[in-house]
């Protein structure tokens, strides 16, 4: 059965300077491959976070993703700024065989509104 990526919130509002959680769960970890968060769509989309060990300032995972059966790939963004506004997508990839990873499923997106403090 095909993996499903669920982002339960269509939108979230957060005051500038505060933190927000963007929720994402998957129904399967197979086929193997990373899960990444992007802001925007298409060629101009921006990588926000990748669950592949790198450090991303102001962003961290919510659950213990070192659990081998973890299906929760939610993230917390701290000290939100107006520049963080936009639609965020949680994307499941299949690892590439000597070629780039292939996107196989995306969540529906969560729009982040940043309110003035």
């Amino acid at each position: 059965t095909e993996v499903k990526v669920t982002q339960p919130e269509k939108s979230v509002s957060v005051a500038a300077g505060d933190s927000t959680i963007l929720n994402c769960t998957v129904t399967s970890l197979l086929p193997v491959g990373p899960i990444r968060w992007y802001r925007g769509v298409g060629q101009s989309r921006l990588l926000i976070y990748s669950f592949t060990g790198e450090h991303f300032p102001r962003i961290r995972n919510v659950s213990d993703t070192t659990k081998r059966n973890n299906m929760d790939f939610s993230i917390r963004i701290s000290n939100v700024t107006p520049e963080d506004a936009g639609t965020y997508y949680c994307v499941k990839f299949q690892r590439g065989s000597s070629e780039p990873d292939t996107e196989i499923q995306s969540g529906g997106g969560t729009e982040v509104y940043v309110l003035a403090k």
Epitope: L30, V32, P34, D64
Partner: antibody, heavy 118, light 108 residues
Framework: DVQLVESGGGVVRPGESLRLSCAAS????????MSWVRQAPGKGLEWLAG????????YYPASVKGRFTISRDNSKNTLYLQMNTLTAEDTAVYYC???????????WGLGTLVTVSS | SYELTQPPSVSVSPGQTARITCSGG??????YAWYQQKPGQAPVTLIY???KRPSNIPERFSGSSSGTTVTLTISGVQAEDEADYYC???????????FGGGTKLTVL
């Protein structure tokens, strides 16, 4: 620099128990999953146990499940392996290893030798 | 018995290219790594996530995959590369870490 130092090995008799320790430094221990791997004399590598960063989830191959127990104390940056009912087949060098994001191993300790002999 | 299959030995002359293969895992559920072990020493990670090389590993070591077979390639083999090489995997379907039986690389 990442450092993993195993201790607790030695000579034990068949049927006895032993607890190995692995002291970690040079990285945020509480953020990484860890594993134990052993190597019998003249043989290949065998994965024995894995544990999540928080310590709540543990994983074993069928060959040692129920006899070996992996645990960790994040306040002490230390990983443990409790081994019960040891037999001569458990004679090996035991290594602790840090896991990558996808549960492969990037850093290894120098190992500690366990000899089970009557 | 080992879940992953490697040739027991590979021989190569200095300066030549050595290739060590590993098979047996399902491509959709496995990640692979390669570990080098010299006599009396602990293993050292050469390649992880199929083809990623730690920063301290020389560029002559590379990993690739094709279907259910992964390959460790050592270009311009040097005498110091003589060692045992282990293929290791992570199987997401069983949460286990199988190894191959190891390949002894002899530099002629």
């Amino acid at each position: 620099d990442v450092q993993l130092v195993e201790s607790g090995g030695g000579v034990v008799r068949p049927g006895e128990s032993l607890r190995l320790s692995c002291a970690a430094s040079g990285f945020t221990f509480s953020s990484n999953a860890m594993s134990w791997v052993r190597q019998a004399p003249g043989k290949g590598l065998e994965w024995l146990a894995g544990i999540s960063a928080g310590g709540s989830d543990t994983y074993y191959p069928a060959s040692v499940k129920g006899r070996f127990t992996i645990s960790r104390d994040n306040s002490k940056n230390t990983l443990y392996l409790q081994m019960n009912t040891l037999t001569a087949e458990d004679t090996a060098v035991y290594y602790c290893a840090r896991e990558t994001w996808n549960h492969l191993f990037d850093y290894w300790g120098l190992g500690t030798l366990v000899t089970v002999s009557s | 018995s080992y879940e992953l299959t490697q040739p027991p030995s590979v021989s190569v002359s200095p300066g030549q290219t050595a290739r060590i293969t590993c098979s047996g895992g399902s491509y959709s559920s496995y990640y692979y790594a390669w570990y080098q072990q010299k006599p009396g020493q602990a293993p050292v990670t050469l390649i992880y996530s199929d083809d990623k090389r730690p920063s301290n590993i020389p560029e002559r070591f590379s990993g690739s995959s094709s279907g259910t077979t992964v390959t460790l390639t050592i270009s311009g083999v040097q005498a110091e590369d003589e060692a045992d090489y282990y293929c290791g995997g992570y199987d997401q379907s069983s949460y286990t870490n199988p190894f191959g039986g190891g390949t002894k690389l002899t530099v002629l």
